[in-house]
């Protein structure tokens, strides 16, 4: 675009240099050239000469009119055709942008990943705005009335050190750009209710050589939370439908879960946990693939025992994946993609 251009005249835009996409736009060019009475004034958009909807208003000024301008960005410049000059003479240039006012941020969620030292808040930004849009996260203590504000572009990480005066907060997000401002709904947050246990990991699996082979899946977490409720989902790699088994877990030792599965099949396992009785789940763990052993000739396989799960007091349900390419539906953004909240001396500029 045109950032610094020495103008020999002026260029201005109505309704303004940033306007709502789809609006009718008039761009004016006024020359102030010495020793030139221009025969013609020309407009260029992104370097290409425009031919239509140009009006010469008077000797020094011309206007180009766009019906329903819908390009997010364009750079405009205008030139003069001066008698006796072989080349056109530059008059002025302007960057113009079109976009939308922001939608109200929706689905605001705040969680604390155990051991992270941060409260991470995410939200849906709505439809693209095409122009620079900022998000201000407001965090107001319900106990002290103190309000903190954080700048963000798509999510925010707030150090729990700055949330020590209180346990209960009101959180909301304000979306702002040149065309408008919208607020999300307010979210009531109790810091004790939004902790997500440290990641659960499936470490290994083995299939025993018994008459009826059983597969034991070993899984663990470094969580310090005592009461944890977990789900393990599993399916053959060729299947669309997940079976889900539920557990009350105590991670003071490695968890072992038993399954009676199809022989000679490749299975995918994933686990996720939450603090018992709370709302927020971990994302599903990385897929763990295990091949069950081949059936020996002696064994009579009983297909009617499908879904081949050792029936204990735990619940088993079936869930169909939307797509075989998407076995891992994230409940929220994975922590690994977040940028770190700027430490002192490490400033993040979203300007």
């Amino acid at each position: 675009g045109i950032t610094s251009i020495n103008c020999s005249g002026d260029m201005w835009v109505e309704p303004g240099e940033i306007f709502q996409m789809g609006m009718n736009v008039s761009i004016y060019c006024q020359e102030a050239l010495k020793h030139c009475r221009p025969r013609n004034l020309y407009f260029y958009k992104n370097g290409f000469k425009e031919e239509f909807d140009i009006t010469r208003i008077n000797r020094t000024t011309a206007r180009i009119w766009y019906k329903g301008f819908s390009e997010p960005h364009a750079y405009m410049h205008c030139t003069a055709e001066c008698p006796g000059h072989f080349q056109e003479t530059l008059i002025c240039g302007k960057d113009i942008s079109s976009g939308h006012p922001p939608d109200a941020p929706s689905n605001l969620t705040c969680v604390i990943y155990e051991y992270s030292g941060n409260m991470t808040c995410t939200w849906n930004t709505g439809k693209p705005t095409y122009i620079d849009t900022k998000y201000i996260v407001h965090v107001k203590s319900l106990e002290t009335e103190e309000e903190q504000q954080y700048l963000a572009s798509s999510y925010v990480k707030i150090s729990t050190d700055s949330l020590q005066g209180s346990r209960k907060y009101l959180v909301w997000v304000q979306a702002v750009n040149s065309l408008g401002m919208e607020n999300s709904q307010q979210l009531h947050v109790h810091l004790d209710d939004i902790v997500i246990p440290s990641a659960s990991i499936i470490s290994r699996a083995e299939t025993t050589n018994d008459t009826v082979p059983k597969t034991i899946v070993y899984w663990k977490s470094k969580t310090m939370i005592e009461k944890v409720f977990c789900e393990m989902r599993y399916k053959t790699t060729t299947n669309q439908t997940w079976s889900v088994k539920e557990f009350d877990a105590n991670f003071t030792y490695v968890q072992q879960s038993e399954f009676y599965l199809e022989p000679d099949s490749k299975y995918v396992f994933q686990v996720r946990c939450q603090e018992t009785g709370k709302r927020n789940w971990q994302p599903w763990s990385s897929p763990f693939v295990h091949q069950t052993s081949q059936e020996t000739g002696k064994r009579n396989w009983q297909p009617w025992s499908s879904p081949f799960v050792h029936q204990t007091s735990q619940t088993v349900s079936q869930v169909t994946a939307k797509s075989s390419h998407e076995p891992q539906k994230m409940e929220m953004l994975s922590a690994t993609i977040f940028r770190g909240h700027p430490a002192s001396g490490n400033h993040q500029d979203i300007g």
Epitope: Q149, Q174, M181, P342, Q348
Partner: nanobody, 118 residues
Framework: QVQLQESGGGLVQPGGSLRLSCAAS????????MTWVRQAPGKGLDWVSG???????VYADSVKGRFTISRDSAKNTLYLQMNSLKTEDTAVYYC????????????RGQGTQVTVSS
Amino acid sequence: QVQLQESGGGLVQPGGSLRLSCAASGFTFSRSAMTWVRQAPGKGLDWVSGIDSGGTTVYADSVKGRFTISRDSAKNTLYLQMNSLKTEDTAVYYCAIGLPWGNTWRTRGQGTQVTVSS
């Protein structure tokens, strides 16, 4: 009692530099977002730059690339480094609590005059 005291203004030629400071007291500066605003002669208040407690910054288009906002929470001080000053930067500069948008900037200091003139 919340107090904000700006300093560092003065007369400077176009293209010159100034560094404004804002000494804060009476509130938890380290947990507060802060903004620089300015008022040109005969005009309303305009925001210039903002910074949150984590150091994330934002700038008005008119000063982007020329001005830099920073903070020192140990000294309870907000700064604005102004380079490549233009005549249109002439204004009274105030520091204020909060971020630029949706604010009336009621909680602000007395201001420091910046005059850019040849």
